[in-house]
Interface confidence: low
Amino acid sequence: DTEIKVNPPQDFEIVDPGYLGYLYLQWQPPLSLDHFKECTVEYELKYRNIGSETWKTIITKNLHYKDGFDLNKGIEAKIHTLLPWQCTNGSEVQSSWAETTYWISPQGIPETKVQDMDCVYYNWQYLLCSWKPGIGVLLDTNYNLFYWYEGLDHALQCVDYIKADGQNIGCRFPYLEASDYKDFYICVNGSSENKPIRSSYFTFQLQNIVKPLPPVYLTFTRESSCEIKLKWSIPLGPIPARCFDYEIEIREDDTTLVTATVENETYTLKTTNETRQLCFVVRSKVNIYCSDDGIWSEWSDKQCWEGEDLSKKTLLR
């Protein structure tokens, strides 16, 4: 019995299509597959950013794979051919590994890249990113922001920069059609007459950086002698009611501070007849059913009741 062997895939490479971190891994079939014409060859692909402790592993019959990477670091990948046991009358046969790497050669020292990059998707409608210039960069340094997400033909440059002292320090994005629940890639690079500027790459999903508007129309309703119902309305905009969590802050008679987190637009508060003053504020956040993360809204305007029977009056802001 001769030992069955198979070659690794050929021409294994990582291709950068210019999508700021979304890369193509591609290869060709191994040499000498003639003996296995009736067989479907599979490939085991492993890849990671250099420095990551874990490999991502994919088994595929295709000759390509696509995924997102952090271009601030290098990428390493390896692949081998798998012959299923059906093809070999026995156990699965694996080739040796073919390996490849990819990295963008860094320009400039780390201190020149943008600092404190911060992106917020206001009310799930308007994306705004801001940053600070690198440490000690001169006023002739300018930064440019490029972005891409699946659905765009190519990376686009910001067209509405926020400026300070003539330098770009932020970007107001246009309407981003069908851009949530997928990776959103950003590169901020720069240029200067007297030194190279380090590029920075960022990846996030827009639904995870939403900052909603605060709730509106806060009201009180006395439900019984010892219960008051607090109510409010969701803000205008595209975020559905099912996507909100709320945090309430309640002050009774300027002493007791109650905080609570709720999922509905109401909260029932136990009180005593001696309550002379009641104030509350509410803020909102996208909940775990609609995103993995989010940013609390600003607090609503404060709503207070003072020295009047709550059963006689419902207050609107």
Partner: antibody, heavy 119, light 111 residues
Framework: QVQLVQSGAEVKKPGASVKVSCKAS????????MNWVRQAPGQGLEWMGR????????HYNQKFKDRVTMTRDTSTSTVYMELSSLRSEDTAVYYC????????????WGQGTLVTVSS | DIVLTQSPSSLSASVGDRATITCRAS??????????MNWFQQKPGKPPKLLIY???RQGSGDPARFSGSGSGTDFTLTISSLQPEDFATYFC?????????FGGGTKLEIK
């Protein structure tokens, strides 16, 4: 939060070696350098060198170049500093300290490890 | 090696006073338009704490009363209004060239 936890105090004889560890947590280990700084009793601070936790590249103070070795283990986010051919003047507190780029300073420090060299 | 000379080596002051510590480098610590000068505070038995980096940028969470200035060879750390917890030893440190070096320290004591 960022934490750098160093190994315990050591007493060594002249001519021996000491290996101090510094375990990092609360941040992406491979994004930073780790520096080693020592301070003799009642004295000032002396930078010994640093290691890039990502690539393992080292920069040593020439004063210690032949005696110091800095290594890192990315699987445990731990950095090690070994000093050989110890002499009494190596008695000091040894600190690890995290740094990003050169201009960012050393922003988080370990609690320090006292190494006493005495016959 | 770049030598850093701090002055004064000790300083007596009262709570509420303004304190100024200077650090002079034997050669310029500027490069790429950045001053590679940092300031640390150290209390007995504790590791140093970064106050100022790149000559004038505040470390995270440090009170606004600490400020740094200077470029080239001459640098200053200023504490605008001394608080009881500010009495400690202060070090300057350059990170322009290996080996990184520290000043000899300034001990700030209560008058």
């Amino acid at each position: 939060q960022v934490q750098l936890v160093q190994s315990g105090a050591e007493v060594k004889k002249p001519g021996a070696s000491v290996k101090v560890s510094c375990k990092a947590s609360g941040y992406t280990f491979t994004n930073y350098w780790m520096n080693w700084v020592r301070q003799a009793p009642g004295q000032g601070l002396e930078w010994m060198g640093r290691i890039d936790a990502y690539a393992g590249e080292t920069h040593y103070n020439q004063k210690f170049k032949d005696r110091v070795t800095m290594t890192r283990d990315t699987s445990t986010s731990t950095v090690y500093m070994e000093l050989s051919s110890l002499r009494s003047e190596d008695t000091a507190v040894y600190y690890c300290a995290r740094g990003y780029g050169d201009a960012y300073g050393m922003d988080h420090w370990g609690q320090g490890t006292l190494v006493t060299v005495s016959s | 090696d770049i030598v850093l000379t701090q002055s004064p080596s000790s300083l007596s002051a009262s709570v509420g006073d303004r304190a100024t510590i200077t650090c002079r480098a034997s050669e310029s610590v500027d490069n790429y338009g950045i001053s590679f000068m940092n300031w640390f505070q150290q209390k007995p038995g504790k590791p140093p704490k970064l106050l100022i980096y790149a000559a004038s940028r505040q470390g995270s969470g440090d009170p606004a009363r600490f400020s740094g200035s200077g470029s080239g060879t001459d640098f200053t750390l200023t504490i605008s209004s001394l608080q009881p917890e500010d009495f400690a030893t202060y070090f300057c440190q350059q990170s322009k060239e290996v080996p990184w070096t520290f000043g000899g320290g300034t001990k700030l004591e209560i008058k």
